[in-house]
């Protein structure tokens, strides 16, 4: 058997660190057997069998010029083996971040914080941390570890499925190369890393007969599980074309009627989502959708209470009475407390 321990990595390759002493081991001889060492393709003897180092070659303060292939020969001239030296660095702790697009699963991605220059792999696992007692801040011995399954095709990502929303997890990502291993531990709670995907299917439509209105509607992101106890809330922004500033509203449901649109101008609208109890952070904005208010023909039917809005064309005070605002009702909300100016214009 070979006297050379096989480091993780391709066969026949041995490893060292620049600036450090490196020992190369002749693989095809018995430990301690004296050998001669040569660089591949060069006749010059690097180290003879009388060195007292047996089957090893010592390179003091290795540098990049020492990288390459070496040949070792036994006393009778037989080939003891060939060894390729590759220089690099031990692993440093990888940089790890985790994110969740829903309340049941999360994924973690990693990057090396320093390139080692050597073949590298990553070991990924997680533990669930549990709190002892309702009032206790002490944590019990954690459960696990379990592997965090990595994406195929070498993507630096692993996914934990079936996570518990109220639990804490400790993620372990270990970078391994032939010179060692280095571990980053990251404590994660689903509540803090939750960031839904943006809402989908955003549509912006004019409201016939109302030149200052647009109706925006959207749906939950497909990645959000459909369970009634984990709802999303939404934030909607809109602005007329060429206008730099966004106006922001927080709709109660899956649609919003904008009542202060600029007549005749196209408007950009976008929407974002967040857990309704404020866990985690807001999603990124959805792709913008565009809509232009209708040019304004008077609708045949006007809600009876709309007749009340006959005051001069000024915005109502903040505390003026407003009709109740339904939350998740699918039917359009034609009028709300921001409508009086437009309503006068339509009725005039």
């Amino acid at each position: 058997s070979s006297p050379c321990p096989q480091a993780w990595g391709p066969p026949g390759v041995q490893y060292g660190q620049p600036g450090r002493s490196v020992k190369l081991c002749c693989p095809g001889v018995t430990a301690g057997d004296p050998v001669s060492w040569f660089r591949d393709g060069e006749p010059k003897l690097l180290q003879g069998p009388d060195s007292g180092l047996g089957h090893e070659l010592v390179l003091a303060q290795a540098d990049s010029t020492d990288e390459g292939t070496y040949i070792c020969q036994t006393l009778d001239g037989a080939l003891g083996g060939t060894v390729t030296l590759q220089l690099g660095y031990p692993p440093a702790r990888p940089v790890v971040s985790c994110q969740a697009a829903d309340y049941e699963n999360f994924s973690c991605t990693w990057s090396p914080s320093q390139i080692s220059g050597l073949p590298t792999r990553y070991l990924t696992s997680y533990r669930k941390k549990t709190v002892l007692g309702a009032d206790s801040q002490r944590r019990s011995p954690s459960t696990g570890p379990w592997p965090c399954p990595q994406d195929p095709l070498g993507a630096a990502r692993c996914v934990v499925h079936g996570a518990e929303f109220w639990s804490q997890y400790r993620i372990n990502v270990t970078e391994v190369n032939p010179l060692g291993a280095s571990t980053r531990l990251l404590d994660v709670s689903l509540q803090s890393i939750l960031r839904p995907d943006p809402p989908q299917g955003l549509r912006v439509e004019s409201v016939p007969g109302y030149p200052r209105r647009l109706r925006a509607s959207w749906t939950y992101p497909a990645s959000w599980p459909c369970q009634p106890h984990f709802l999303l809330k939404f934030r909607l922004q809109y602005r007329p074309a060429q206008h730099p500033a966004w106006s922001t509203v927080e709709p109660a449901g899956l649609e919003e009627v904008i009542t202060d649109a600029v007549a005749g101008l196209p408007h950009a609208v976008r929407v974002s989502a967040r857990d309704f109890l404020d866990a985690g952070t807001w999603s990124t904005w959805s792709p913008e959708a565009w809509g232009t208010p209708s040019t304004g023909t008077i609708p045949k039917e006007i809600p009876a209470w709309g007749q009340l809005h006959t005051q001069p064309e000024v915005e109502p005070q903040v505390d003026s009475p407003a009709p109740p605002r339904p939350s998740l009702q699918p039917h359009p909300r034609l009028l709300d407390h921001r409508d009086s100016v437009e309503q006068v214009a339509v009725l005039a």
Partner: antibody, heavy 118, light 107 residues
């Protein structure tokens, strides 16, 4: 010679923007994470932002999140810090640093002074 | 974020004195603690890394110890060129934090 050289500092009004650069030489820039650390006049050191060798992971101090963006161009051996919506409290000497293992800063530049004032 | 406290905030000592600075982390940081020296108008310089390892080229009169939350930095025999501010810094997590510094001068 192994060194880092910052540039791009200067006087800017509150709300304004500035882009700092850090030119690296003497080491394999693309193998290392890089960092910005700042020091307000007469105050201590404050970590600002770091970026991994590939640029794929970045991290920011809460005080600059959403306003500053760290980036790098490995082909030019250069690190950048884009600073927007600057405030008076961003006034500081900004140092570029090379960390080992993300947070062990074994090489520092000389720093560039950023002054935010009207 | 992990908070770092240092004491004392300043000290005066005589040449040849033994000087000790302590640093405390708000939570366990293992041994991921570094010490830096900064002279006026200059960039910081790494002296000690991972709590107790002397950076290459740094005089052996500087040393460090500790792990977990409590750390100590020592200058065994203060020299005039050691007048500076000394900072501890943790890097256990992805948001490194520095202590407020200890200013050392000569009596």
């Amino acid at each position: 010679e192994v060194q880092l050289l910052e540039s791009g500092g200067g006087l800017v009004q509150p709300g304004g923007s500035l882009r700092l650069s850090c030119a690296a030489s003497g080491f394999t820039f693309s193998w290392y994470s890089m960092t910005w650390v700042r020091q307000a006049p007469g105050k201590g050191l404050e970590w600002v932002s770091s970026i991994v060798p590939s640029g794929g992971h970045t991290q920011y101090a809460d005080s600059v999140k959403g306003r500053f963006t760290i980036s790098r161009d490995n082909s030019k051996n250069t690190l950048y810090l884009q600073m927007n919506s600057l405030r008076a409290e961003d006034t500081a000497v900004y140092y570029c640093a090379k960390p080992h293992d993300w947070g062990l800063f074994d090489l520092w530049g000389r720093g560039t002074l950023v002054t935010v004032s009207s | 974020d992990i908070q770092m406290t240092q004491s004392p905030s300043s000290l005066s000592a005589s040449v040849g004195d033994r000087v000790t600075i302590t640093c405390q982390a708000s939570q366990d940081i293992n041994n991921y603690l570094n010490w830096y020296q900064q002279k006026p108008g200059k960039a910081p310089k790494l002296l000690i890394y991972d709590a107790s390892n002397l950076q290459t080229g740094v005089p052996s009169r500087f040393s460090g110890s500790g792990s977990g939350t409590d750390f100590t930095f020592t200058i065994s025999s203060l020299q005039p060129e050691d007048i500076a501010t000394y900072y501890c810094q943790q890097y256990d997590n992805l948001s490194p934090t520095f202590g407020p510094g200890t200013k050392v001068d000569i009596k």
